[in-house]
């Protein structure tokens, strides 16, 4: 029959060429002479001339060696025609399958593969995957089936078998415990890929395994004991720098130190921070230390890392003995701010108060006193006793120097230390009011019409405090009551001035006497401008001109 079974041809054939493969034969050749031809890729189209056919015998010929990795299968058509060129058969499909030879070695996809794994992991932990390819067939043969293996490991510490590789997938995993970055930070594995499922050609590559840091080393104080000297009262003073060593990766959270004062700082006098570059612990004073109260502090400082430990590790502790150094301390007024009530206007030379300071130092130092700031110059201070006396008139109503009844004075105490030190205190004199001001009307100038005049309401003010103020009383003097009346309102804080008789247009003085609740009297002259007008007026109209 005009059919042909698929033809298998091994690649890389030795020849000789042309090589007969199979014979095309039409049973129509009994009736007529048949001529054979082939068409298709590999025959009359690219790649041309790989196959040919003997025109008269029908032998299919291979003209050169085949390469399966280039073309694994050829599909040709066979034709049979009579002498006159007429087709005697339908075109026949010819399949030529190129069978594989193991003519390619495996190739790793990279010369060097890089992976990483955390130190201290257990066997079974995946590290990385390597890949090799082989162009040969891996479906019908083992020619392209790659098996992976580890040829060598460097260094061979702590064992020569730290890693293994899955023979089929190329996944490298940990086979032994003992990965320790601090001892071996990197392993170099020579890996092999062998075709024929491990029995064929071999190629090698390198797998570099970086061992990643875990916080498996505690920071350790070096040294563990420190002595420091600190002047008393110094705040923010650097006491000591504590040094630690940590075998973990520098500048990582597993290396960066965290310091904690574990004991000895009952008064919360100290603080400790980590230096960002050196990793040292910087111990400083949070509050001033007091030599007289405690001249030595023994601190216990523990160090850990920013990152938690991955396993139970003993923590390192340092002992710091802090010696407090005595300094000449300034005298301190007791209290720092003293409030004294004193009546305003007391006589000159009258004692106001005694204001003294104490010296924190143990020695009996002599303290002398003086006034540092006395804005009005009202006071004097005895340099030995701290006695404050009045040398001027204390005036509660003096708005330049007194605020809210308080006159503020700053005093100074100086010891006789070497060098001497000074301390200041604030004396707050609360001035008690005396009835030293009479009531005053506002305004003191009025304009009023001499016909149907409007009553003039004047406000009454008194610089003193209650009870030396309202209710006020009003009285007209010096015959002012002939033309005018003055009445204090019910509340007693305003006076109403009224014109009771006609006065011609002019300016007049109204003599008004006001007294407060303590009968302090004040005479005030009110300038009254009377105008020729009716009712309400603010300024007198000009003279009327008729037309």
């Amino acid at each position: 029959d005009w059919v042909v079974a698929p033809i298998s041809v091994p690649e890389n054939g030795k020849g000789p060429f042309p090589q007969r493969l199979n014979q095309l034969k039409s049973n129509k050749d009994r009736d007529t002479k048949i001529f054979y031809s082939i068409t298709g890729p590999g025959a009359d189209s690219p790649p041309e001339g790989v196959f040919a056919v003997e025109k008269e015998t029908g032998w299919l010929l291979l003209n050169k060696p085949l390469d399966r990795e280039e073309i694994a299968k050829y599909e040709l058509f066979g034709h049979a025609v009579s002498e006159n060129g007429a087709s005697v058969e339908d075109p026949m499909n010819i399949s030529i399958i190129v069978t594989d030879q193991n003519d390619h070695k495996p190739k790793f996809t990279q010369d060097t593969f890089r992976g990483s794994v955390l130190e201290g992991v257990l066997p079974g932990t995946s590290v990385m995957q390597v890949t090799a390819t082989d162009e040969d067939d891996a479906i019908y043969t083992y020619n392209g089936v790659v098996a992976y293996s580890i040829h060598s490991q460097e260094p061979k510490d702590p064992h020569d078998l730290m890693f293994t590789i899955h023979r089929s997938t190329g996944t490298i995993s940990v086979i032994s415990s003992g990965l320790d970055r601090e001892k071996v930070p990197e392993y170099t594995l020579t890996i092999q890929a062998t075709d024929m499922d491990g029995d064929g050609s071999t190629t090698t590559a390198v797998a570099v395994v970086e061992i990643l840091d875990a916080n498996d080393n505690a920071p350790m104080f070096d040294p563990q004991k420190y002595e420091a000297h600190v002047p008393e009262n110094a705040v923010g003073h650097e006491v000591q720098r504590l040094t630690v060593t940590d075998l973990d990766a520098p500048n990582s959270p597993a290396w960066r130190a965290t310091y904690l004062i574990m004991g000895g700082d009952d008064g919360d006098h100290f603080t400790i921070t980590t230096h960002p570059e050196s990793n040292q612990g910087i111990l400083t004073t949070r509050k001033g230390l007091d030599f007289e109260a405690k001249n030595q502090h023994t601190l216990y400082v523990e160090v850990t890392n920013e990152a938690p430990f991955v396993l139970k590790l003993p923590t390192s502790t340092a002992t710091i003995v802090v010696h407090v150094e005595d300094v000449n301390e300034a005298p301190v007024f007791v209290p720092p701010s003293k409030v004294v009530e004193v009546q305003e206007g007391i006589p000159t030379g009258e004692p106001v108060c005694v204001y003294t300071a104490e010296d924190p130092d143990k020695e009996n130092q002599k303290i002398s006193y003086r006034i540092l700031r006395d804005p009005a110059g009202w006071l004097a201070m005895d340099p030995d006793s701290g006695q404050v006396t009045a040398v001027g008139t204390l005036d509660r109503e003096d708005e330049q120097f007194v605020r809210n009844n308080i006159y503020e004075v700053m005093v100074l105490a100086m010891d006789n230390g070497s060098p001497p030190t000074t301390g200041t205190g604030t004396l707050l004199l609360t001035l008690i009011d005396v009835n030293d001001h009479g009531p005053v009307p506002e305004p003191r100038q009025i304009t009023i019409c001499n016909q149907s005049p409007v009553r003039q309401v004047l406000n009454i003010t008194d610089k003193d405090l209650s009870p030396h103020t309202s209710p006020f009383q009003a009285q007209l003097t010096d015959d002012s009551d002939i033309y005018w009346t003055a009445e204090v309102n019910e509340e007693g804080d305003t006076v109403v001035l009224s014109l009771k008789k006609f006065l011609k247009q002019d300016t007049y003085d109204v003599h008004l006497s006001l007294s407060d609740h303590g009968n302090k009297e004040q005479l005030t002259v009110i300038r009254a401008t009377v105008c020729d007008c009716h009712g309400h007026v603010e300024t007198c109209p000009g003279p009327w001109k008729g037309g």
Partner: antibody, heavy 117, light 111 residues
Framework: EVQLLESGGGLVQPGGSLRLSCAAS????????MSWVRQAPGKGLEWVSA????????YYADSVKGRFTISRDNSKNTLYLQMNSLRAEDTAVYYC??????????WGQGTMVTVSS | QSALTQPASVSGSPGQSITISCTGT?????????VSWYQQHPGKAPKLILS???KRPSGVSNRFSGSKSGNTASLSISGLQAEDEADYYC???????????FGGGTKLTVL
């Protein structure tokens, strides 16, 4: 001579706790992962838990996860297994074993744990 | 049910040879050359007799040998002796948190 010696086994009621110890000698203890393997009466060997040489990494069989805790003290060359919420099916001989590459070697002599009311 | 499959029992007469198989998958026995065999006498702890498929620790008789083909490993004992009667277990490395798989064990009887 390389030696592993387990202790701490005994009779305990269901829901109770027990702590097993394994004292190691004759090798650099901190360089090796260690495992606990158990064998129920008349049954095969069953891996229970493992811990890395440093103690920073641990594995557990699903059957004991959340109930058992493996730990080690390298300064004392001792491996521990803290067993909580014990069940009848935890009854077994418990062995400690050193993990050499791809093997368990050597093994301790075992300690019997009986969980029964 | 164990991860690796072993025959429950095998037997042989003194002087004979026997083989115990241990079948896994392409991700354990088939993937790695880390198959080990252990011998356990009644009431005793297991003892390593072969590691890495066919490596004998010192002190183990050369009558014990191992091999591997595909996903199956085998333990062979030649010249059977009475003291060989014991349970035999295989283990294989595998990647993951259960990094060592156990076989169910094989009871060897020396007739």
């Amino acid at each position: 001579e390389v030696q592993l010696l387990e202790s701490g086994g005994g009779l305990v009621q269901p829901g109770g706790s027990l702590r097993l110890s394994c004292a190691a000698s004759g090798f650099t203890f901190s360089s090796y992962a260690m495992s606990w393997v158990r064998q129920a009466p008349g049954k095969g060997l069953e891996w229970v838990s493992a811990i890395s040489g440093s103690g920073g990494s641990t594995y557990y069989a699903d059957s004991v996860k959340g109930r058992f805790t493996i730990s080690r003290d390298n300064s004392k060359n001792t491996l521990y297994l803290q067993m909580n919420s014990l069940r009848a099916e935890d009854t077994a001989v418990y062995y400690c074993a050193t993990n050499s590459p791809g093997t368990f070697d050597p093994w301790g002599q075992g300690t019997m744990v009986t969980v029964s009311s | 049910q164990s991860a690796l499959t072993q025959p429950a029992s095998v037997s042989g007469s003194p002087g004979q040879s026997i083989t115990i198989s241990c079948t896994g998958t392409s991700n354990d026995v088939g993937a790695y050359n880390y198959v080990s065999w252990y011998q356990q006498h009644p009431g005793k702890a297991p003892k390593l007799i072969l590691s890495e498929v066919n490596k004998r620790p010192s002190g183990v008789s050369n009558r014990f040998s191992g091999s591997k083909s595909g996903n199956t490993a085998s333990l062979s004992i030649s010249g059977l002796q009475a003291e060989d009667e014991a349970d035999y277990y295989c283990t294989s490395y595998t990647m993951g948190s259960t990094f060592m798989l156990f076989g169910g064990g094989t009871k060897l009887t020396v007739l």
